[in-house]
């Protein structure tokens, strides 16, 4: 597992998306076999 600290990003305010992580998905983990 990894640990990060929540610090402000320098991302552009032009984006309409929140800078928070999207809901977790199993698609980001390796499939067994």
């Amino acid at each position: 597992s990894e640990t990060t600290t929540g610090t402000s990003s320098n991302s552009s305010q032009s984006t309409s998306n929140s800078g928070l992580a999207p809901n977790p998905t199993n698609a980001t983990t390796k499939a067994a076999g």
């Epitope: 991302s11 305010q13 929140s18 800078g19 977790p24 998905t25």
Partner: antibody
Amino acid sequence: EVQLQQSGPELVKPGASVRISCKASGYSFTGYYMNWVKQSPEKNLEWIGEINPITGGSTYNQKFVAKATLTVDRSSSTAYMQLKSLTSEDSAVYYCTRRDYDTSLDYWGQGTTLTVSS
Amino acid sequence: DVQITQSPSYLAASPGETITINCRASKSISKYLAWYQEKPGKTIKLLIYAGSTLQSGIPSRFSGSGYGTDFTLTISSLEPEDFAMYYCQQHNEYPLTFGAGTKLELK
């Protein structure tokens, strides 16, 4: 019905550690980040951090990096927060709360009161 | 970190009145502000997210507005059960941050 059931009140001595639990039910535990929030006696709310229940990866408020450790047990749909090197400043109510990307902190536990006193 | 300034800290009103609570962010948070209600003996409840979207099951007398740095929660025609503590919180970036709260009391 989404429910987050937290462990009971804790009275601990300065310098000790404590682990608070949060058992989730009524939804897919791995589908949402679990967040933790501190409410001081003055009623101020502070975000501690969040954990991805699939990977176990955590993001912390810099203020709590040396204080809190977040873990999960997927088999029991339970999230844990360990607090170490406790002082009177850590006396507070601690909440677990589910974070949905769209709606933010949409369900909250009932809170766990921590009292640090000798 | 994004600082959130919430005002007023205390508000006295009567049932049937309309009240407003304000939150100001130290920099733009787009539309990403949420509002919560806390009542003794109850779990904290999400009222509004993304500035103006009403959470499922919340009465329509609650409404939110604002964008960028300035946001408002309005409660129209106050009901007795609305007297509680209210908090705003930005969900635009890490770390999540909260306003200091507004205590709404019965006049």
